[in-house]
Interface confidence: medium
């Protein structure tokens, strides 16, 4: 588990200071301003290594280069959502980590990077286009994913491209939705600021409204839009996967998994208790994700020897700066 670097919660002025309308007018610009300021092009990086052990393990490392707070990370094998893939692990900053064979020892490395050890024994089927993908759901950026295909063949007889071609993409819904909201928000913010200039400041007067109502209302649009942007994080894989993934997940999985487009053989049956776990009512993107994960319950990570390729006591450092060599 790790401590999560959350986006600072926007504290609206106390409702007692002005009416509900005035409250909305003051809070919304701040929400939109935060979204505008934090809007950037986040990137996700993926690195896969073969561990130098007789067990032939693979280590997948992924990181998110964005300013938002990460609410969910999903690692899959076999391709991105569009191409189909099989989920290997889901990591949540608060609710914990779930992993499925042949994944072993998924963990947070830093607040914005994760690592996952994969048992190589399961990866016994040959495949020239095996792809590992990492998807980061974050607020306010939305959902971002990067995939890396295994070192391609330079053999003209094989169909792989001659140079590594990383897939770095945001989900269309995330791009269009968040970008649209941000664009509209920034324009609306300017409009509000202009209008605010040309009108007298509201008089401070006690509000007759319940203190809770305006707060919930102020966040409601954010919750709705982010819930609409939410995409399933499990992916299906029809082309190439390790042999052990053809077996059912031994430890069960989240009850919400059944509703996601996973391979039929990979829909684990979770205990009924998971379904009864209430979704937290906090109106933020992180809360929506937490709710989904709360249903999933937690499973202790696979035990086994911690295989480290690098004796360096510092361990792999988190990626800094742009992709590639600094």
């Amino acid at each position: 588990m790790r401590t999560e670097a959350q986006v600072p919660a926007l504290q609206p002025p106390e409702p007692g200071l002005e009416g509900a309308m005035g409250h909305r007018t003051l809070v919304l610009p701040w929400v939109l301003l935060t979204l505008c300021v934090t809007a950037g092009t986040p990137e996700v990086w993926v690195q896969v290594r073969m561990e130098a052990t007789e067990l032939s393990s693979f280590t997948i490392r992924c990181g998110f280069l964005g300013s938002g707070s990460i609410s969910l990370v999903t690692v899959s094998w076999g391709g991105p959502n569009g191409a189909g893939g099989t989920t290997l692990a889901v990591l949540h900053p608060e609710r914990g980590i779930r992993q499925w064979a042949p994944a072993r020892q998924a963990r947070w490395e830093t607040q914005s990077s994760i690592s996952l050890i994969l048992e190589g024994s399961g990866a016994s089927s040959p495949c020239a286009n095996t792809t590992f993908c990492c998807k980061f759901a974050s607020f306010p950026e939305g959902s971002w994913e990067a995939c890396g295909s295994l070192p391609p063949s330079s053999d003209p007889g094989l169909s792989a491209p001659p140079t590594p071609a990383p897939i770095l993409r945001a989900d269309l819904a995330g791009i269009l939705g968040v970008s649209g909201v941000l664009l509209f928000g920034c324009v609306y913010l300017l409009h509000l600021l202009r209008r605010h200039k040309h009108r007298p400041a509201p008089r401070l007067q006690p509000s007759r409204t319940s203190p809770q109502a305006p707060r919930a209302r102020a966040w409601a649009p954010s919750q709705a839009s982010q819930a609409a942007l939410h995409v399933p994080y499990a992916t299906i894989n029809t082309s190439c996967r390790p042999a052990t993934l053809d077996t059912a997940h031994p430890h069960g999985g989240p009850s919400w998994w059944a509703s996601l487009p996973t391979h039929a053989a990979h829909r684990p049956q979770g205990p009924a208790a998971w379904a009864s776990t209430p979704i937290p009512a906090r109106g933020s993107f992180v809360s929506v994700e937490n709710g989904l994960y709360a249903q999933a319950g937690e499973r202790p990570p696979h035990t086994g020897p911690g295989l480290t390729l690098f004796p360096d006591p510092r361990g792999p450092r988190a990626m800094e700066g742009p992709l590639g060599v600094r």
């Epitope: 996700v44 016994s124 990067a146 295994l150 070192p151 053999d155 990383p166 360096d312 792999p316 590639g324």
Partner: antibody, heavy 128, light 113 residues
Framework: EVQLVQSGAEVKKPGSSVKVSCKAS????????ISWVRQAPGQGLEWMGG????????NYAQKFQGRVTITADKSTSTAYMELSSLRSEDTAVYYC?????????????????????WGQGTTVTVSS | DVVMTQSPLSLPVTPGEPASISCRSS???????????LDWYLQKPGQSPQLLIY???NRASGVPDRFSGSGSGTDFTLKISRVEAEDVGVYYC??????????FGGGTKVEIK
């Protein structure tokens, strides 16, 4: 202990081809990258290409592109390197070596970021 | 392509004395993961090369602790704290970061004075 055993010495005519084998015993074969490195008489080491048997993907140094073919047979834990259109300057000792690989989404990949097990070498002489 | 330059070409050494070999890369070998993708190999006379140091500073299994690797980016050094007679041979550095493939240095021949 892992060992890589290579096929015996070869004498070839210019223009012909040579196929050198490299059989792994005593350890994992298919998950590692197998690289081929050659050393001309009195010269240094030169990487020719490599393959990751488990994925069947091969990659070659630009210098040898189109002339070298690297394959692997997982069932026999054997890798092969075939060099065609031989010339006298291809006379060298050819080594196979095993090592772990990596790749990442920024476009870096290596067919062995180090080579911890080496074959004994196969001498190929190209002479008319 | 990345060019690896080793110096000196030849290094006469006295047993028990320290020795140092330099390797310079035309491009940085420091990956964003914090590791330098540089290895050191020793090829003893009439033998296959053997791995000494990997990822810049990590000693390979079975390598005596008198061997150490250091450096970062483009400049690297292999040090032998006390040379022994069995250490003679040609030492090669190798980069494994920049594709296509890996690139070896020209080699440094270590011989007893």
């Amino acid at each position: 202990e892992v060992q890589l055993v290579q096929s015996g010495a070869e004498v070839k005519k210019p223009g012909s081809s040579v196929k050198v084998s490299c059989k792994a015993s005593g350890g994992t074969f298919s998950s590692y990258a197998i690289s081929w490195v050659r050393q001309a008489p009195g010269q240094g080491l030169e990487w020719m290409g490599g393959i990751i048997p488990i994925f069947g993907t091969a990659n070659y140094a630009q210098k040898f592109q189109g002339r070298v073919t690297i394959t692997a047979d997982k069932s026999t834990s054997t890798a092969y390197m075939e060099l065609s259109s031989l010339r006298s300057e291809d006379t060298a000792v050819y080594y196979c070596a095993r090592g772990p690989w990596y790749y990442d989404s920024s476009g870096y990949s290596s067919y062995a970021y180090y080579m911890d097990v080496w074959g004994q070498g196969t001498t190929v002489t190209v002479s008319s | 392509d990345v060019v690896m330059t080793q110096s000196p070409l030849s290094l006469p050494v006295t047993p028990g004395e320290p020795a140092s070999i330099s390797c310079r890369s035309s491009q940085s070998l420091l990956h964003s993961d914090g590791y330098n993708y540089l290895d050191w190999y020793l090829q003893k006379p009439g033998q296959s090369p053997q791995l000494l140091i990997y990822l810049g500073s990590n000693r390979a299994s079975g390598v005596p602790d008198r061997f150490s690797g250091s450096g970062s980016g483009t400049d690297f050094t292999l040090k032998i704290s006390r040379v022994e007679a069995e250490d003679v041979g040609v030492y090669y550095c190798m980069q494994a970061l920049h594709t296509p493939g890996v690139t070896f240095g020209g080699g440094t021949k270590v011989e007893i004075k």
